[in-house]
Interface confidence: low
């Protein structure tokens, strides 16, 4: 009933709760002397479904047959309308439309841990839209029964609050769930199980790892489990990996030796437990243990390269470079690099530990046969040394690779190609492709990059430390025993016209011609490899086209003579620079008048 219904009643037949698709009869009747004040014939009873009129009738009562009501609750309200007054609410009723419960499916029960309680879940089936009561019943040996009810409209879980014990692990228990509402009832199929079937162990806890003698090869994982656990499965992976390694163990008694861990790697470990070989279910995975394995002696050898620079008639500078070992080779934190320099004939040797750098420079005599050995050391030991004989890498002209070219290959890549040397190509043991940013001053501090290529390769894609709009000096070395030959080329991955022209800093007269000197364009304005400089000149105040002279670009060159100027004529001169993409704007303009010989 909706309110006090003082003026009348609303009755619903056959029931306020009906099956979907059923018809109901709704009657609204006024109580005596509750109609309109003067004329009862003027009583107009109106039936509303929610806020919508569905029927009306003049008199003391109204009958309405209603069909097609939707699932859920529908509100009907009866109102009285008299002449010259507002409608008055008489009474109302809610009708509940639903269905009988379906048979609960997939009843399954579980006890979490040996000390836990039995709880069951099931699938309710489609929503009844009605208040539905679920009763869960468990029967066990010796006619023991337990029962639990839940009256939640969405009930699909109940905990009995009882603990099954392992005294008779093979004893059978049967669970059944029954759903009841106003329109009917239905029971699940019974589910029969034993203690071993339904106890799901708690996940292992207190997980720890021990490395005997700080060695990764002697590693034991420890954990604690409930007393009846028979099986464990372990999973572990490096923290930066998505793939797990899995191990199944029986009767582990809370410990297991792991034999395949990598050194100096952070791992994540998890363990799960089970009570019986083929009964019951696995526990949840334990909380993760994260642990870093100890270091081991480095494996692998450093990739070492070098550069020689002439200082004077008796001395040369040797710069050694090496690449970091990969993480899997370093097997720990590299504390220092050990560099040994040895004169092979006299036996003099010098050893130095280098920390924080992957290069070393020293000055040695130009005479003698020199060799270096470089190794990497962590807390557990050193890698095998890489040995290199210092030789003149470009001495053997017949070993020089031919037709070296460098072409842009996509973003920040350069494809270097070459032809084998004229000398027996089969003598080549390996090629080394070296590249560094081109600096006009030949700066030895510029980082050096290199890669090694097998003797049958005639190309290499260089991508490490390659920037757009920067020119690189690229050398290809062919190595054979104690000999080497080399060829070089300039290359860039991306280029455009230079941003500025060279700055003329001086014009001097020499024997009837002039010498123009200029400052190099700053590297960041060259926008790639320069191919040419152009020197332009024209008579001052003349409208004629300027003359020009084009000079191939050479790193070291910053002056050039011009001998076609007329004496005692004032000229304006300027310069530009060109890359493969185009010509720069003008550099500064300078005026000059060639004096010539006096008559």
């Amino acid at each position: 009933k909706i309110d006090a219904c003082k003026r009348g009643d609303v009755t619903v037949k056959p029931s306020h709760v009906i099956l979907l698709g059923s018809t109901v009869n709704i009657t609204c009747s006024l109580k005596p002397r509750q109609g309109c004040f003067h004329y009862s014939r003027r009583n107009k009873l109106i039936l509303y479904k929610f806020d919508r009129r569905i029927n009306f009738h003049h008199g003391h009562s109204l009958n309405s047959q209603v069909t097609g009501l939707p699932l859920g609750t529908t509100l009907f309200v009866c109102k009285l309308a008299c002449i010259n007054s507002d409608e008055i609410q008489i009474c109302g009723a809610e009708i509940f439309v639903g269905v009988a419960p379906e048979q609960p499916q997939n009843l399954s029960c579980i006890q979490k841990g040996e000390q836990g309680t039995v709880a069951c879940t099931w699938e309710r089936g489609r929503d009844t839209h009605l208040y539905t009561e679920y009763t869960l019943q468990l029967s066990g040996p010796k006619n023991l029964t337990w029962q639990k009810q839940c009256k939640d409209i969405y009930c699909d879980y109940l905990d009995f609050g009882i603990n099954l014990t392992p005294e008779s692990p093979e004893s059978n228990f049967t669970a059944k769930v029954t759903a009841v509402n106003s329109l009917g009832s239905s029971s699940s199929l019974p589910s029969t199980f034993t203690f071993l079937d339904i106890v799901r162990p708690l996940p292992p806890w207190d997980i720890r790892i021990k490395f005997q003698k700080a060695s990764v090869s002697r590693c034991t994982l420890y954990w604690r489990d409930e007393g009846l656990v028979l099986l464990n499965r372990l999973r572990y992976r490096p923290s930066n990996s998505r793939l797990w390694n899995m191990v199944n163990v029986t009767k582990a008694k809370g410990r297991h030796d792991l034999l395949d861990l990598k050194p100096f790697t952070e791992y994540e470990f998890q363990i799960s437990s089970k009570l019986h070989l083929y009964k019951g279910s696995w526990s949840d995975w334990s909380e993760s243990l994260r642990a870093q394995t100890p270091e081991e002696e480095p494996t692998g050898m450093l990739d070492v390269w070098y550069m020689k620079r002439h200082i004077d008639y008796s001395r040369q500078q040797i710069s050694l470079f090496w690449k970091n070992l990969s993480v899997s080779e370093a097997r720990g934190k590299i504390l220092h690099y050990q560099v040994t320099l040895q004169e092979l004939t006299g036996g003099k040797a010098m050893t130095q530990n280098i920390t924080g750098h992957t290069s070393w420079t020293t000055v040695i005599p130009r005479t003698g046969n020199w060799a270096v050995a470089v190794s990497a050391a962590n807390s557990k030991g050193s890698s095998l040394p890489t040995r290199i004989n210092i030789m003149n890498l470009c001495e053997a002209g017949l070993l020089a690779p031919r037709q070296v070219s460098a072409n842009s290959e996509g973003m920040d890549n350069i494809l270097v190609t070459w032809q084998p040397p004229r000398k027996d190509p089969s003598a080549v043991q390996e090629y080394v492709v070296e590249w560094r940013e081109l600096h006009p001053g030949g700066d030895t501090q510029v980082p050096l990059n290199w890669l090694r290529s097998r003797p049958y390769n005639v190309s290499a894609l260089i991508s490490e430390n390659i920037k757009s709009y920067i020119c690189y000096e690229i050398r290809v070395y062919a190595l054979s025993g104690d000999q080497g030959g080399c060829s070089s080329i300039l290359g860039n991955s991306k280029h455009k016209a230079p941003l500025s022209g060279p700055h003329i800093n001086a014009i001097t007269e020499e024997k009837g011609s002039i010498l123009i000197s200029w400052n190099s364009i700053p590297v960041q304005e060259q926008m790639g490899c320069l191919l040419h400089y152009r020197i332009y000149w024209k008579e001052r105040d003349s409208n004629s086209q300027p003359q020009l002279c084009e000079i191939p670009y050479r790193v070291s060159q910053n002056s050039h003579p011009i001998n076609s100027l007329q004496p005692r004529v004032t000229y304006v001169l300027w310069m530009t620079a060109l890359t493969a993409a185009g010509e720069s704007s003008h550099g500064n303009e300078r005026e000059f008048c060639l004096q010539g010989k006096a008559n």
Partner: nanobody, 125 residues
């Protein structure tokens, strides 16, 4: 012989900050963990945060995540616990503890063989 000595406790107002220090000596390898625990009368020790000395990896219990921060200074052999936004319920005796091996997690008190003497922290207005 391993020794741990705490300092830095005291009285602080709610919302205030405090930095506890743990001076560490005697460990013979880098494979060890220092953790901070706290205990109030009648309650078990609660693990708050730990740091692995080899690589400074850290762990925090949910109760202090975002408020407390653990750090180390290898040169001085010190481990610090910076405590911000302190609440009255943070009042306790704070103790640092140590153990060999590389396990990081919060850990239970019985897993730590080496303990300091503790320092009192009182949060009250």
């Amino acid at each position: 012989e391993v020794q741990l000595v705490e300092s830095g406790g005291g009285l602080v107002q709610p919302g205030g900050s405090l930095r506890l220090s743990c001076a560490v000596s005697g460990f013979t390898s880098d494979y060890y963990v220092i953790a901070w625990f706290r205990q109030t009368p009648g309650h078990e020790r609660e693990g708050l945060s730990s740091i692995r000395i080899g690589d400074s990896a850290t762990f925090y219990a949910d109760s202090v995540k975002g408020r407390f921060s653990i750090s180390r200074d290898n040169a001085k052999n010190m481990v610090y616990l910076q405590m911000n936004s302190l609440k009255p319920e943070d009042t306790a005796v704070y103790t640092c503890a140590g153990r060999y091996d590389t396990l990081l997690g919060g850990g239970r008190p019985r897993e730590f063989p080496y303990w300091g003497q503790g320092t009192q922290v009182t949060v009250s207005s």
